[in-house]
């Protein structure tokens, strides 16, 4: 049974041009995370593997950077940029769990930092 | 010890597909990616794709969208790569190799050689 | 596309000559968020599949050698063997794992003189 929990940033927004830290905490279980892939829609951005470290997508490696722990940086931002962000953590034994952050980027200098939520 | 062995040499005709097999023993399958390199005599090596097992995600060289379809069947260890619509221009080697982030193509396979011939 | 050209083409060597070989790429391949480059270096001797020998442009693959070393960093790099042994006579081919397409040079052709 699947009893965790994905903790993420939720909804933010950032400049254009700047840069923003995405990141999900897995708790209140006591599965071992052996793997987390950073999505963007479909397109994978970057693995974080227990064993073999980061790998960062060739696509991204000018705007993607690794961590802090298993978030992920983004940045030179665009409003391109603006969507659906998912950390998917492979576990062992519970399995999958996703959590999802939508980040919007804004032109002007009015952004701010939505508040955190919680997704079973 | 880490093995990729690839299905055998290949005479097919014209206009045919040909589907190339490349089984992995020795490492988790689903931690590395699977590239696949041609290789002709005077045009040296060139990156057809590559596909994450793990997750299925595939990449492309633009040049060979359309040619070559990569898949792979976690159940087995096996990657696949399937040419299709080949002409002369497809006859090469074409190795399978495996690849993760920072450590570049640590292991080959033998190469399989695709001749298209009428 | 990163382009990667290698010279020279071809290297005649004598056995327990020391030669170097070099990969020059269009663009950067260091990596800034852990200051680490992209390139790597095959050796394909005639009638193998090519050989992994440095990665992150001078870390040795476990097994080489260490008579194979590599250097350089940026746009500039270089394969030095410091004794060539006969089994070394191959082509040598540097490749950048950057960014999509993956791409590699040319080759370097290491022939006995």
């Known amino acids: 049974m699947m009893t965790g929990t994905i903790e993420t940033t939720g909804n933010i927004s950032a400049e254009k041009g700047g840069s923003i830290i995405l990141q999900c905490h897995l708790s209140s279980t006591t599965a071992q995370v052996t793997q987390v892939n950073w999505e963007q829609q479909d397109q994978l951005l970057a693995i974080c593997n227990a064993d073999l470290g980061w790998h960062i997508s060739p696509s991204f490696k000018d705007r993607v950077a690794p961590g802090p722990g298993l978030g992920l940086t983004l940045q030179s931002l665009t409003v391109n940029d603006t969507g659906e962000y998912f950390c998917i953590y492979h576990t062992y034994p519970d399995g999958t769990y996703t959590g999802r952050i939508f980040l919007e980027v804004l032109e002007s200098s009015v952004a701010e930092h939505g508040a955190r939520f919680q997704i079973p | 010890q880490v093995q990729l062995q690839q299905s055998g040499d290949e005479l097919v005709r014209p206009g045919t597909s040909v589907k190339v097999s490349c089984q992995a023993a020795?490492?988790?399958?689903?931690?590395?990616?699977i590239l696949w390199i041609k290789q002709r005599p005077r045009h040296g090596l060139e990156w057809i794709g590559d596909i994450y097992p793990g997750g299925h995600y595939t990449n492309y060289n633009e040049k060979f969208k359309g040619k070559a379809t990569l898949t792979a069947d976690t159940s087995s260890s096996t990657a696949y790569m399937q040419l299709n619509s080949l002409t002369s221009e497809d006859s090469a080697i074409y190795y399978c190799?495996?690849?993760?982030?920072?450590?570049?193509?640590?292991?080959w396979g033998q190469g399989t050689s695709v001749t298209v011939s009428s | 596309d990163i382009v990667m050209s290698q010279s020279p083409s071809s290297l005649p060597v004598s056995v327990g000559e020391k030669v170097t070989m070099s990969c020059k790429s269009s663009q950067s391949l260091l990596y800034n968020s852990n200051q680490k480059n992209y390139l790597a270096w095959y050796q394909q001797i005639p009638g193998q599949s090519p050989k992994l020998l440095i990665y992150w442009a001078s870390t040795g693959e476990s097994g080489v050698p260490d008579r194979f070393t590599g250097s350089g960093s940026g746009t500039d790099f270089t394969l030095t063997i410091s004794s060539v042994k006969a089994e070394d006579l191959a082509v040598y081919y540097c490749q950048q794992y950057y960014s999509y397409p993956f791409t590699f040079g040319s080759g370097t052709k290491l022939e006995i003189k």
């Open positions: 190799t495996r690849y993760y982030g920072p450590y570049a193509m640590d292991y």
């Open positions: 020795g490492y988790t399958f689903t931690n590395y990616w």
